[in-house]
């Protein structure tokens, strides 16, 4: 009897009520491997979840998060809210970045502005909650008589903190 069941392909189940006949999975269910005695119920993507891939007889539905949220966990099991640029997500919701920090993304944490003086440079453009400072030439380069042939150094890409 076991051998009969092992012949049932994905998308079917081995129906004990019908002498081990391979029956197609009912609507809204699937079997991703052969030889299964039951089909699994399809995942439903509703509420904050939206369907990325429809369920078929051989594979489960795949969900994504609706606009304003992003996926967390295995197979997008959870949806976490996005924040605006200039904010960070805390345990109590989205909070504005403190002065001296910025976040140019909808997720992640606020990071300190680049300290231009550590590289011997000056601040060319002030930082905001949404943007890092832009470092320019060193103060010495801007003094009278200094050569202006050297273009300003590009802004340093800030290091990304872990989520």
């Amino acid at each position: 009897l076991q051998d009969l069941c092992s012949n049932c392909p994905a998308g079917t189940f081995c129906d004990n009520n019908r002498s081990q006949i391979c029956s197609p999975c009912p609507p809204n269910s699937f079997s991703s491997a052969g030889g299964q005695r039951t089909c699994d119920i399809c995942r439903q993507c509703k509420g904050v979840f939206k369907t990325r891939k429809e369920c078929s007889s051989t594979s489960n539905a795949e969900c994504d998060c609706i606009s304003g949220y992003h996926c967390l966990g295995a197979e997008c099991s959870m949806c976490e809210q996005d924040c605006k640029q200039g904010q960070e997500l805390t345990k109590k919701g989205c909070k504005d970045c403190c002065f001296g920090t910025f976040n140019d993304q909808k997720r992640g944490i606020c990071r300190p502005w680049t300290n231009c003086s550590l590289d011997g440079k000056s601040v060319l453009v002030n930082g905001t909650k949404e943007r890092d400072v832009v470092c320019g030439p060193s103060p010495a380069d801007l003094s009278p008589g200094a050569s202006s042939a050297t273009p300003p150094a590009p802004a340093r890409e800030p290091g990304h903190s872990p989520q």
Epitope: L89, T90, K92, P162
Partner: nanobody
């Protein structure tokens, strides 16, 4: 491999109680803070409560303060959430999560591992 396995969810009437458990393996449990979060139907994640690695510091969302109690048994590598005076709005999938350090707060998320979740339904 780091694993978190929640249990204890179920159907309960308003005003009732449930105790959720989270069995941890694959890491030195007492070295890390732990957190409970939940996802109500059709909504995003909500932070519920956090506890430091030693168990000495606990934090709660305003919505559960005075009703829920987080605790841990480091000798059993298990995290708990005792939920009393349950309300319909507590209906959610509850996830246990490991934080990245031993300390925690009610501010930053510092979660690096999630469990699979256990469903709590509060209904009459």
């Amino acid at each position: 491999e780091v694993q978190l396995l929640e249990s204890g969810g179920g159907l309960v009437q308003p005003g009732g109680s449930l105790r959720l458990s989270c069995a941890a393996s694959g890491f030195t449990f007492s070295n890390y803070a732990m957190t409970w979060v939940r996802q109500p139907p059709g909504k995003g994640l909500e932070w519920v409560s956090s506890i430091s690695g030693s168990g000495g510091s606990t934090y709660y969302a305003d919505s559960v303060k005075g009703r829920f109690t987080i605790s841990r048994d480091n000798s059993k590598n298990t995290l708990y959430l005792q939920m009393n005076s349950l309300r319909a709005e507590d209906t959610a999938v509850y996830y246990c999560a490991k934080e990245g350090t031993g300390t925690t707060s009610d501010y930053y998320y510092n979660v690096d591992v999630w469990g699979q979740g256990t469903t709590v339904t509060v209904s009459s």
